[in-house]
């Protein structure tokens, strides 16, 4: 990330509100709980790759394997969901690629009306066969860890049988779970052997234990609930954009910067320039000029279009994006070739009409 002296002030946000434009999402990798997931870091020339999840350094463990440019998650759980990034550190710079991981299945949460199979969970016994409680559908109990977004509905199920018919009660963190323990209380569907909590909040996090008992015995099963909250993020830029470009003198070129931001982003296009014949200020930092920024007078700020370029336009162009949370920036180089020379392709380029002919 460059430091610099500014020829023109780059403020945190524009004085006028940015116009609305499409905000692009990072790539999303979806896995079901228990599956393994492998993601390749889509960055080139990486001397060292480091990984983060939700901004926190990610190291290898018994389920996370980091081999070269690959991240492997074994036996994925909903807690593995989040915003991941791989950063390629090079001798002169570093680049980051972001992607989302979503580990989910339909049983994680949902309302109490989806129990079409509830009746078969309620097993009636022959009155002569006295029997201690037992689980009738362990498949529905395999997923012990439930990571659920705040405000969702959560359902825990303990389908059981026994004779006489067992009763079911619920504990939270080992203590009796009372209605007054949470705003809005909770529902128990005895017919479905389920506990339902609507609109979960972080204070609902914890261990929930169903205790199923009759006079012949008692069994229990514990679920762990984690309520996942989103916090606003600094902007994220799509890897590889803007892309290096080349064109001939007099040609046109476009640089594109794809932004993902859940707070209104402010985009600036900045170029290294000379001031009084020098590229660097007294502090040793390069001089930069803001060419374009998002605002009322700026159309599509994600695109910087240069027309009728001259050799003086060659150089590094920086897409700098900020919101009130933080910043991100990535850069690309423009090569301007003499008129008689045909430009060579570098990455994905948007070339001038001259070149296309």
């Amino acid at each position: 990330r460059p430091s610099f002296s500014l020829v023109e002030d780059t403020t945190l946000e524009p004085e006028e509100p940015p116009t609305k434009y499409q905000i692009s999402q990072p790539e999303v990798y979806v896995a079901a709980p228990g599956e393994s997931l492998e993601v390749r870091c889509l960055l080139k020339d990486a001397a060292v790759i480091s990984w983060t999840k939700d901004g926190v350094h990610l190291g290898p463990n018994n389920r996370t394997v980091l081999i070269g440019e690959y991240l492997q998650i074994k036996g994925a759980t909903p807690r593995d969901s989040g915003l991941y990034a791989c950063t390629a550190s090079r001798t002169v710079d570093s680049e980051t690629w972001y992607f989302m991981v979503n580990v989910t299945d339909a049983i994680s949460s949902g309302d109490d009306e989806d129990d079409t199979d509830g009746a078969e969970d309620f097993v009636s016994e022959n009155s002569n066969n006295k029997r201690a409680p037992y689980w009738t559908n362990t498949e529905k109990m395999e997923k012990r860890l439930h990571a659920v977004p705040a405000a969702n509905t959560v359902k825990f199920r303990c389908p059981a049988g026994g004779n006489p018919m067992p009763t079911m009660r619920w504990l939270k963190n080992g203590k009796e779970f009372k209605q007054e323990h949470r705003i809005g209380g909770y529902k128990v569907r005895n017919q479905h052997w389920s506990l339902i909590m609507e609109s979960v909040v972080p204070s609902d996090k914890g261990n929930y234990t169903c205790v199923v008992e009759n006079e012949y015995g008692s069994i229990n099963h514990t679920y762990h609930l984690d309520v996942v909250e989103r916090s606003p993020h600094r902007p994220i830029l799509q890897a590889g954009l803007p892309a290096n470009a080349s064109t001939v003198v007099g040609g046109d070129v476009e640089f594109v910067c794809k932004v993902y931001s859940d707070a209104q982003p402010h985009i600036q296009w900045i170029k290294h320039v000379e001031k009084n014949g020098s590229k660097y200020g007294p502090d040793g930092l390069p001089y930069l000029k803001v060419l374009k920024h998002s605002g009322i007078n700026s159309s599509n700020a994600e695109v910087l279009a240069l027309f009728n370029v001259t050799e003086a336009d060659a150089g590094e162009y920086i897409c700098k994006v900020s919101n009130y949370i933080g910043q991100a920036n990535q850069s690309a180089w423009l090569t301007v070739l003499p008129k008689q020379q045909a430009p060579g392709r570098e990455k994905e380029i948007t070339a001038s009409p001259d070149y296309l002919e």
């Epitope: 430091s3 524009p14 509100p17 901004g55 600094r234 209104q264 900020s322 009130y324």
Partner: antibody, heavy 113, light 107 residues
């Protein structure tokens, strides 16, 4: 967990300067703006400015631009807000906040002759 | 600068009541609005970001709505611990202006 710990209360004379510190921990310091917010007695909240520790970028409310200076020391994960040429109306509680999500406990600055 | 106008400036309600506080911006802020709760002697606490998103650890009785220039903070069932001053804030463009505040008391 994320924590912002501010320096203690200050009593200053008019015309003097004050430098309030805000030490951050529990997150990647360079990746978030630190904002400064003023609350004068009986008044509402007023945004003063922000600094991005990664590159030192600053943005100021014009009302404070002349007298307030924000700096960041990445080696100690600390941000400083210096207010010069103090006057009585600068008497207030000053808060630092990480992207307005996490807030320091506030520093009371009293300007009195 | 974007001006933020909050109303009412103060209100008194009973425990269990539904309470609404409104905030108007002098121009379109595209949903870039935060709500804060400030209790006496305490730091402000983020309740809602991006006009509608509940912040970490905030009870679900708090909700935010609105778009363009008009925004609302709703407390679905007022609790004694909700006594505080509530502020809205423009986070679209600098300066990040706050509303004048709404002081909420229990009857």
């Amino acid at each position: 967990q994320v924590q912002l710990v501010q320096s203690g209360a200050e009593v200053k004379k008019p015309g003097a300067s004050v430098k309030v510190s805000c030490k951050a921990s529990g997150y990647i310091f360079r990746n978030y703006y630190i904002h400064w917010v003023k609350q004068a007695p009986g008044q509402g909240l007023e945004w003063m400015g922000a600094i991005y520790p990664d590159n030192g970028d600053t943005s100021y409310n014009q009302r404070f631009k002349v007298r307030a200076t924000l700096t960041a020391d990445t080696s100690t994960s600390t941000v400083y807000m210096e207010l010069s040429s103090l006057r009585s109306e600068d008497t207030a509680v000053y808060y630092c906040a990480r992207a307005f999500t996490y807030w320091g406990q506030g520093t009371t600055v009293t300007v009195s002759s | 600068d974007i001006q933020m106008t909050q109303s009412p400036s103060s209100l008194s309600a009973s425990v269990g009541d539904r309470v609404t506080i409104t905030c108007g911006a002098s121009e379109n802020i595209y949903g870039a609005l935060n709500w804060y709760q400030r209790k006496p002697g305490k730091s402000p606490k983020l309740l809602i970001y991006g006009a509608t998103n509940l912040a970490d650890g905030v009870p679900s009785r708090f909700s935010g709505s609105g778009s363009g220039t008009d925004y609302t903070l709703t407390i679905s069932s007022l609790q004694p611990e909700d006594v505080a001053t509530y502020y809205c804030q423009n986070v679209l463009s600098t300066p990040y202006t706050f509303g004048g505040g709404t002081k909420l008391e229990i009857k």
